[in-house]
């Protein structure tokens, strides 16, 4: 994987990232919502990409809790039976069916806040989440297709004469790798059982005036560029070139 580098600014140019636990929410400010929600769509579905290891808050339709009869969260995760979390206002009781993940909870007491939270989102939280609100005016739904995003681990190394390998390991979805300058490249994808994908791009540069090569990894969680200085092949006879 190349020689040990003097500092972080040569072989593995790792972008500095903030790993603090972030929270994301698609909840709207209820003051901005039309009072009469029935004039809006009665059912809203949203695709929502969420970064792994962050916190997520999912919201019900903006219906005043005083008008409520029942709130139900329906959670459909891959390979698991459907989980439901229900709250009946009249009796002030909550009920859960087939819900085993302790990280998926009501944000607070459902009589105060109908939102659902996922603490420290994991790959297993990929799925469909739907809030169903039963009111005297009818049923209102809001659904989320939650797509958990996993930042790939990026490495770059030279493995043969003027050939470099860039890997974006275990990303979700698959990362896209491009090079500066463009080389003669082959890209392979490896799919893992947990839904992540490793992308490996191997490039060769025949032209000898290429000094450094940059691997640019594009991903929904953010982009990263690494570069290395191409080294002569070990054991090769010395040469002198003009540029």
């Amino acid at each position: 994987e190349g020689a040990a580098q003097p500092n972080n600014s040569l072989m593995l140019q790792t972008s500095k990232e903030n790993h603090a636990l972030a929270s994301s929410s698609l909840c709207m400010d209820e003051k901005q919502i039309t009072q009469n929600y029935s004039k809006v769509l009665a059912e809203v579905n949203t695709s929502w990409p969420v970064k792994m290891a962050t916190n997520a808050v999912l919201c019900c339709p903006p219906i005043a809790l005083r008008n409520l009869i029942i709130i139900t969260w329906e959670i459909i995760l891959r390979g698991q039976p459907s989980c439901t979390k229900a709250y009946k206002k009249e009796t002030n009781e909550t009920k859960e069916t087939n819900c085993t993940d302790e990280r998926i909870t009501w944000v607070s007491r459902p009589d105060q806040n109908s939102d659902l939270q996922i603490r420290t989102v994991a790959i297993t939280h990929d799925g469909y989440y739907r809030c169903i609100m039963v009111t005297p005016d009818g049923n209102f739904h809001r659904g989320y297709h939650l797509q958990v995003l996993v930042t790939p681990e990026v490495t770059l190394f030279q493995n043969r004469n003027r050939t470099a390998v860039c890997k974006a390991v275990a990303g979700k979805p698959a990362a896209h790798i491009s090079w500066i300058p463009e080389g003669d490249c082959a890209t392979k994808q490896e799919y893992w059982s947990n839904g992540t994908v490793t992308v490996k791009s191997t490039c060769h540069w025949e032209v000898h005036n290429v000094s450094t090569v940059t691997c640019h990894v594009s991903h929904l969680t953010g982009n990263k560029s690494l570069y290395i200085e191409l080294l002569p092949v070990p054991g090769a006879k010395k040469s002198a070139k003009l540029y």
Epitope: P181, N209, V210, T212, K241
Partner: antibody, heavy 114, light 105 residues
Framework: EVQLQQSGTVLARPGASVKMSCEAS????????MHWVKQSPGQGLEWVGA????????NYNQKFKGKAKLTAVTSASTAYMELSSLTNEDSAVYYC???????WGQGTLVTVSA | DVQMIQSPSSLSASLGDKVTMTCQAS????LNWFQQKPGKAPKLLIY???NLEDGVPPRFSGSGYGTDFTLTISSLEDEDMATYFC?????????FGGGTKLEIK
């Protein structure tokens, strides 16, 4: 800690040759290209060439063909640049640098004067 | 050779100002940004277009891709008075921008 220590100021006559050194420490000397950069008074920076101490491969800027010669002694972790047939145009500060500009020597001032 | 056009060649700004300078390359490249003070060697600020070198204040940032690149100082400080260079290291010969001399008003 990575350090590049360059030899001191040189005063030379036109037509003469000078050889300056760059001693490296704090990293594996044979694993990185060592580049040399020229900075003339009040001017920008110009790449002279580079040497890979691991096998003494060299790359030169066409402009410095026949002017600069790069060598390295791995046992001393030291790179050298020799400038020949000096003229006033060669008066400048010369830097050695490695790891794609991460580390620089303090520079060697060469003054060519009759 | 890759031509590097750096602009402006000089600029004067007040303390606290946001300052930007640009480098334009004749080919698609990757670059580093350096700061140089009189009588001193260049100091690496930004590597690989946008990565802040260890120990460099976060008021410095780099951006761009391909042929157009920018160095930004978000809030100018006294110690930032220097000349700034870009370097393209993708192709040999390496080529530098002409430099931007930054002065404090």
């Amino acid at each position: 800690e990575v350090q590049l220590q360059q030899s001191g100021t040189v005063l030379a006559r036109p037509g003469a040759s000078v050889k300056m050194s760059c001693e490296a420490s704090g990293y594996t000397f044979t694993s990185y290209w060592m580049h040399w950069v020229k900075q003339s008074p009040g001017q920008g920076l110009e790449w002279v060439g580079a040497i890979y101490p691991g096998n003494s491969d060299t790359n030169y800027n066409q402009k410095f063909k026949g002017k600069a010669k790069l060598t390295a002694v791995t046992s001393a972790s030291t790179a050298y640049m020799e400038l020949s047939s000096l003229t006033n145009e060669d008066s400048a500060v010369y830097y050695c640098t490695t790891a794609v500009g991460s580390y620089w020597g303090q520079g060697t001032l060469v003054t060519v004067s009759a | 050779d890759v031509q590097m056009i750096q602009s402006p060649s000089s600029l004067s700004a007040s303390l606290g100002d946001k300052v930007t300078m640009t480098c334009q390359a004749s080919h698609t490249i990757n670059l580093n940004w350096f700061q140089q003070k009189p009588g001193k060697a260049p100091k690496l600020l930004i590597y690989g277009t946008s990565n802040l070198e260890d120990g460099v204040p976060p008021r410095f940032s780099g951006s761009g891709y391909g042929t157009d690149f920018t160095l930004t100082i978000s809030s100018l400080e006294d110690e930032d008075m220097a000349t700034y260079f870009c370097l393209q290291h993708t192709y040999l010969p390496w080529t530098f921008g002409g430099g931007t001399k930054l002065e404090i008003k």
